[in-house]
């Protein structure tokens, strides 16, 4: 598949030179689509173009992150006179065209959503053959993936002066609130770190000093649910044993 880099022509495509106002290039996408992790989501995208009876070869493309330059997650091509768009790329096999590009519909279905899919997506169509033309959505559609909390790591680590500290990291969207409970603790929010740069769905809470042996439980909760995990601290001659 030849991908042209001359996308500067997009501005020309919106001018009177190309077509009457009723048949300009345009793309219609919603600002945002929300879905839960593990489910499927549909990213709607329809378009208008000035070549009303175009029957030549076409390519439909979806990319993630940024328009024009972001990585492609889906691509299909339809031959002249065909309504069958043959998939050439579907990242991890999770992207499937729902719409019919011949009928101005590039809507995409994303299966088995993960929090990592939470980003902006951009649809694009390219005509080849008699007509060489292309258009891509500038603003795209934001896929907002929500998820119940999941504790991804819980551990006990040594700290200075023969003490121990506990770390709990959880992911979820909205980012979960974390709380520790354990011997002589009651319920403690402990030191909760803000979501880390580039890891917007991860939250970490630290118990800086574990003073008693026993079971320490981390609970993560958001509007979609809660999750908990425990570690055990046993001190034998200055050593620790931890299990979850």
């Amino acid at each position: 598949f030849v991908r042209t880099k001359i996308d500067t022509t997009e501005n020309l495509l919106n001018t009177e030179v190309h077509s009457s106002p009723a048949q300009r290039w345009s793309m219609q996408v919603p600002p945002e689509v929300s879905a839960e992790a593990g489910d499927a989501a549909v990213l709607p995208c329809t378009f208008t173009h000035p070549h009303r009876h175009y029957d030549g070869p076409l390519t439909a493309i979806w990319r993630a992150g940024e328009p024009y330059a972001g990585p492609q997650v889906f691509r299909c091509a339809a031959a002249r006179g065909s309504e069958l768009c043959q998939t050439a790329l579907s990242l991890h096999g999770r992207f499937r065209l729902l719409g019919n590009p011949r009928r101005n519909d590039l809507s995409l279905r994303v299966e088995r959503l993960a929090l990592a899919d939470d980003r902006r997506y951009f649809c694009r169509v390219e005509f080849a053959g008699d007509v060489h033309d292309r258009y891509e959505s500038r603003h795209g559609v934001r896929l907002h993936v929500t998820a119940a909390p999941r504790i991804v790591n819980i551990s006990v680590l040594p700290s200075p002066a023969h003490a121990f500290r506990a770390l709990c990291t959880a992911e979820g969207e909205p980012p979960p609130a974390l709380a520790w409970s354990g011997p002589a603790l009651g319920n403690s929010l402990a030191a909760v770190r803000s979501p880390r740069e580039g890891h917007g769905h991860l939250v970490t809470a630290e118990l800086p000093a574990l003073t008693h042996d026993g079971r320490y439980t981390c609970t993560a909760a958001n509007s979609l649910g809660r999750s908990e995990a425990s570690v055990y601290l046993f001190r034998f001659h200055g050593a620790s044993g931890a299990s979850t």
């Epitope: 048949q23 329809t46 101005n104």
Partner: antibody, heavy 116, light 112 residues
Framework: QVQLKQSGAELVKPGASVKISCKAS????????VNWVKQRPGQGLEWIGK????????YYNEKFKGKATLTADKSSSTAYMQLSSLTSEDSAVYFC?????????WGQGTLVTVSA | DIVMTQAAPSVPVTPGESVSISCRSS???????????LYWFLQRPGQSPQLLIY???NLASGVPDRFGGSGSGTAFTLRISRVEAEDVGFYYC?????????FGGGTRLEIK
Amino acid sequence: QVQLKQSGAELVKPGASVKISCKASGYIFTDYYVNWVKQRPGQGLEWIGKIGPGSVSIYYNEKFKGKATLTADKSSSTAYMQLSSLTSEDSAVYFCASYYYGFAYWGQGTLVTVSA
Amino acid sequence: DIVMTQAAPSVPVTPGESVSISCRSSKSLLHSNGNTYLYWFLQRPGQSPQLLIYRMSNLASGVPDRFGGSGSGTAFTLRISRVEAEDVGFYYCMQHLEYPYTFGGGTRLEIK
């Protein structure tokens, strides 16, 4: 030139199954849907469904779900339709059609006769 | 399902004259993209159907320009000018806007 060549006439017993074929030539088989159409003797045309060879795209007329099963073999550029639990109502000529706009070329038809 | 109706079961015509065959749909076949998803087919006696017109008014490859299609969203006409003996057979309209695709009952063109 584009051609769709269908398998020969079939005489089958009630309750049995039959599989008819449609071999395409003269174009890239995987680029176009293959449609299947039923025509009972002296009657009109009825769309059964269509398959996109080499893709997961299969569409059925609800009326024929459970009756017709569409498959395709890319390596031989052949589409197949299996008809199951046959009754006298299934006695008909079955056509495949493909290429531009889905219906630009038609096979010569396969006559299926269901009779005890 | 969209119902396609061809009211006239048969239309007699004299060779050299013009004739119109009509078809109606229970729902508009005009898509938001401006195209009208209607086909016209001719099935000559003992033969397979042949595509004449696609998207209501576009002549299929190899079809003589004596054939023409027109219409609105729900009412369609196939016009044949200078009818020839080889034009006899059944003419079917078909919608492919929505699944399942549906055909009209057919109109038989016969020579007077």
